[in-house]
């Protein structure tokens, strides 16, 4: 926890943030909570970004106050107004841009005092991989595809039966730039797969880690995938 300073004769209040990551082109959340106040009109929320001249967002006297908002955030921010009274100062950021990455400060003033906490926000692209059997190939082949990643990730194959095996010699990974010229489509092909085995395609960059699993037996194919954001820590 980072405790806000007691300033100007006021007491300090506890403000808590959680480092997070935004998926470019989608909406993101910058999380911040604080000791609630009984009166909404006494609560001021200010979001700042290091290196940016104006405010990211300001909420005071029960409504948004955007006269000092920086132009790079215009029309893209909102707080959860109905949850401010219970201590939620989280910010919704629409259409996340690569340039939104950086250090943010959640700055709170209530009748109890002031407090602030910083938050590291990373931006990139990440998506769930899907693993399929490539029936067009001459041998038993698996194809792992994920539509949007940035920065360029690493791709590693693993198998339940051959744990610890290195599949780099029998796999081929390509990255295809998407139409917006930032994100890339990830395609990885694994050759010479054996039946009755579970294979995992693991895609990872410094923002997210995603895994696509496929289990191939004589009678069925089972798929499972999951995605985990990295470095989400509270402060």
């Amino acid at each position: 926890l980072i405790i806000g300073f007691g300033i100007s004769g006021r007491h300090s209040i506890t403000v808590t943030t959680v480092a997070s990551a935004g998926n470019i082109g989608e909406d993101g959340i910058l999380s911040c909570t604080f000791e609630p106040d009984i009166k909404l009109s006494d609560i001021v929320i200010q979001w700042l970004k290091e290196g940016v001249l104006g405010l990211v967002h300001e909420f005071k006297e029960g409504k948004d106050e955007l006269s000092e908002q920086d132009e790079m955030f215009r029309g893209r921010t909102a707080v959860f107004a109905d949850q401010v009274i219970v201590g939620n100062a989280s910010l919704r950021l629409k259409n996340v841009q690569l340039t939104d990455a950086g250090t943010y400060k959640c700055y709170i003033i209530t009748s109890k005092g002031k407090g602030n906490a910083n938050l590291e926000y990373k931006t990139g692209a990440f998506s769930m991989p899907e693993v399929n059997v490539d029936y067009n190939a001459s041998s038993e082949t698996l194809r792992c595809e994920a539509p949007r990643w940035f920065p360029q990730p690493t791709v590693v194959w693993a198998s339940q039966v051959d744990q610890g095996a290195n599949f780099s010699e029998v796999s081929n990974t390509s990255f295809e730039l998407n139409s917006e010229n930032v994100t890339m489509k990830v395609v990885s092909v694994l050759y010479n797969v054996t039946i009755n085995n579970t294979y995992s395609c693991m895609i990872e960059n410094d923002i997210a880690k995603a895994t696509g699993d496929i289990k191939v037996t004589e009678s069925e194919i089972k798929r499972r995938s999951h995605l985990q954001l990295l470095n989400s820590k509270a402060s």
Epitope: L48, G51, E71, M72, G102, K105, K114
Partner: antibody
Framework: EVQLLESGGGLVQPGGSLRLSCAAS????????MKWVRQAPGKGLEWVST????????YYADSVKGRFTISRDNSKNTLYLQMNSLRAEDTAVYYC???????????WGQGTLVTVSS | DIQLTQFPSTLSASVGDRITITCRAS??????LAWYQQKPGKAPKLLIY???SLESGVPSRFSGSGSGTEFTLTISSLQPDDFATYYC????????FGQGTKVEIK
């Protein structure tokens, strides 16, 4: 470690031009607004110009508007100040500085001296 | 343009003293005010931003307060390293500096 290194200062005649550069390192340059501030010998600080991180927005003090141009090359991590139609009253140490929180400026270069004299 | 008036222009004090410098804005600037310290031949150093937030690495004997048009910088116990010139700067509408306060040894 954040470092800002100004260069390009020197002696110039009234009406002449100079281009100051500020080489930045130790931070993601394109994410931070930058500014130029000057200080005439024995005098206080005077804000000159500011640019947003992208370079898309620029601001100028009335005393230099129309004569000075701030710009940045984010691929080279460098800030510039093109100074035209220089006057004796432009004589000063010119500092570049990096924006921190709430439009304050947390890191400054060591300064470069510009002398306008005939 | 927003004008900043700083006073006193010179302040004589001794090590251990508590000193206060005032900065007055010609119109309300909310809490968009910063304080800097400058020593001869050196670049300014940021002490306080947003009127009362202490810059990282700055000793806690420095504090800022105020809002609107009236602001103060306080040094709770003056140290030998604190003898310098102090400037306030408004960041609300463009940027303007106060004329400076020189803190000298009594």
């Amino acid at each position: 470690e954040v470092q800002l290194l100004e260069s390009g200062g020197g002696l110039v005649q009234p009406g002449g031009s100079l281009r100051l550069s500020c080489a930045a390192s130790g931070f993601t340059f394109s994410s931070y607004a930058m500014k130029w501030v000057r200080q005439a010998p024995g005098k206080g600080l005077e804000w000159v110009s500011t640019t947003s991180g992208s370079g898309g927005t620029t601001y100028y003090a009335d005393s230099v508007k129309g004569r000075f141009t701030i710009s940045r090359d984010n691929s080279k991590n460098t800030l510039y100040l093109q100074m035209n139609s220089l006057r004796a009253e432009d004589t000063a140490v010119y500092y570049c500085a990096k924006a921190g929180w709430a439009a304050a400026f947390d890191y400054w270069g060591q300064g470069t001296l510009v002398t306008v004299s005939s | 343009d927003i004008q900043l008036t700083q006073f006193p222009s010179t302040l004589s004090a001794s090590v251990g003293d508590r000193i206060t410098i005032t900065c007055r804005a010609s119109q309300s600037i909310s809490d968009w005010l910063a304080w800097y310290q400058q020593k001869p031949g050196k670049a300014p150093k940021l002490l306080i931003y947003k009127a009362s937030s202490l810059e990282s690495g700055v000793p806690s004997r420095f504090s800022g307060s105020g809002s609107g048009t009236e602001f103060t910088l306080t040094i709770s116990s003056l140290q030998p390293d604190d003898f310098a010139t102090y400037y306030c700067q408004q960041c609300n509408s463009y940027w303007t500096f106060g004329q400076g306060t020189k803190v000298e040894i009594k």
